[in-house]
């Protein structure tokens, strides 16, 4: 048995944050789970981490230098990225992982989130300003 | 179908042990938890604790440690539950009854007919 | 641990008669609650499963309901076949106990 994943097709990070949403088809609230994000098509890079035991605060880490916090719904995790580089755009899975009690249970490959960094661009001011009117 | 055929019914003397078999069938043995449930005459379910065959992981209630041990056959599809020390508070029936995961939520819809153990001097 | 307070602990009523039977525990359990029918010399039958989930096969006679901290079975119509012993299990954590058990009579 596998847990279902949903995430958004596509994200656009204005200001460099985003939310990615993870939703399962599974209620962890009674689990110890380890819910992570990974980034490429290859998921080489596991950008942020959650680890929930019900009876305890929710663990958040990152081992690969990226500013993230996660969130904790009955089935789903969000994970809140901020500080994003223009060239971290990529595409982003979410992973669920089911340790206790057993058996362990883990989720079918989504198909991922594009998310799209957009930098933050100043409009400059204009040099030649259009004629004035009389 | 899943099955969950129990030992028959024991007679026993004070501070005697007893080992009940929960044989299992119609499901694969090592991907699911087998709880043990306690039932006193006149008293409600008492819950003794949980057999996990895949990996041997053991969960006690507490006020069953020392009196009740969960062991399990994997060949033969089989867990235990042996009780020591026996006194008249131990007479009981005792079920089997397979853990099922709904979706992250757990009940226990499969049991075993049950086994009564009387002890008596 | 976590305590599981069942009432009524016995109930007598009339074909027909709506029932109900609560179960509160000392903490929020967030619905991992089953319930139980068990009859005399049986093994108990799930009828419930995550609060309000009604096992395939049980008549929708049967229902569940609440969240938090407090659950109640609810009997719509009673039938003859309705009476015996039900219990609440939570499965928040171990132990995995029980409610008290509620004896249901027929009047």
């Known amino acids: 048995n596998k847990i279902l994943v949903k995430q958004s097709p596509m994200l656009v990070a204005y200001d460099n944050a985003v939310n990615l949403s993870c939703k399962y088809s599974y209620n962890l609230f009674s689990r110890e789970f380890r819910a992570s994000l990974h980034k490429g098509l290859d998921s080489a890079v596991e950008v942020c981490v959650v680890y929930g035991n019900y009876s305890q605060q929710l663990q958040v880490y990152s081992k690969t230098g990226f500013n993230c916090d996660g969130k904790l719904g009955n089935e789903s995790v969000t994970f809140y990225l901020q500080n994003l580089y223009v060239n971290q755009t990529d595409i982003y899975f979410c992973k669920i992982e089911v340790m206790y009690p057993p058996p362990y249970l883990d989720n079918e490959k989504s198909n991922g989130t594009i998310i799209h960094v957009k930098g933050k661009h100043l409009c400059p001011s204009p040099l030649f300003p259009g004629p004035s009117k009389p | 179908q899943v099955q969950l055929q129990q030992s028959g019914a024991e007679l026993k003397k004070p501070g005697a042990s007893v080992k009940v078999s929960c044989k299992a069938s119609?499901?694969?043995?090592?991907?699911?938890?087998i709880h043990w449930i306690k039932l006193r005459s006149g008293q409600g379910l008492e819950w003794i604790g949980w057999f996990y065959p895949g990996s041997n992981d053991i969960q006690y209630n507490a006020q069953f440690k020392g009196k009740a041990t969960l062991t399990a056959d994997k060949s033969s599809s089989t867990v235990y539950m042996e009780l020591t020390g026996l006194t008249p508070e131990d007479s009981a029936v005792y079920f089997c009854?397979?853990?099922?995961?709904?979706?992250?939520?757990?009940?226990?819809?499969?049991w075993g007919q049950g086994t009564l153990v009387t002890v008596s001097a | 641990d976590i305590q599981m307070t069942q009432s009524p602990s016995s109930l007598s009523a009339s074909v027909g008669d709506r029932v109900t039977i609560t179960c509160k525990t000392n903490?929020?359990?967030?619905?991992?609650l089953a319930w139980y029918q068990q009859k005399d010399g049986k093994s108990p039958q799930l009828l419930i499963y995550?609060?309000?989930h009604l096992v395939e096969g049980v008549p929708s006679r049967f229902s569940g309901s609440g969240s938090g901290t407090q659950y109640s079975l609810t009997i719509s119509s009673l039938q003859p076949e309705d009476f015996g012993n039900y219990y609440c299990?939570?499965?928040?954590?171990?132990?995995?106990?029980f409610g008290g058990g509620t004896k249901l009579e027929i009047k």
């Open positions: 119609g499901y694969t043995f090592t991907e699911y938890i």
């Open positions: 995550a609060a309000t």
């Open positions: 299990q939570h499965f928040w954590g171990t132990p995995c106990t």
């Open positions: 009854a397979r853990r099922d995961d709904f979706s992250g939520y757990d009940a226990l819809p499969y």
């Open positions: 903490e929020n359990i967030y619905s991992n």
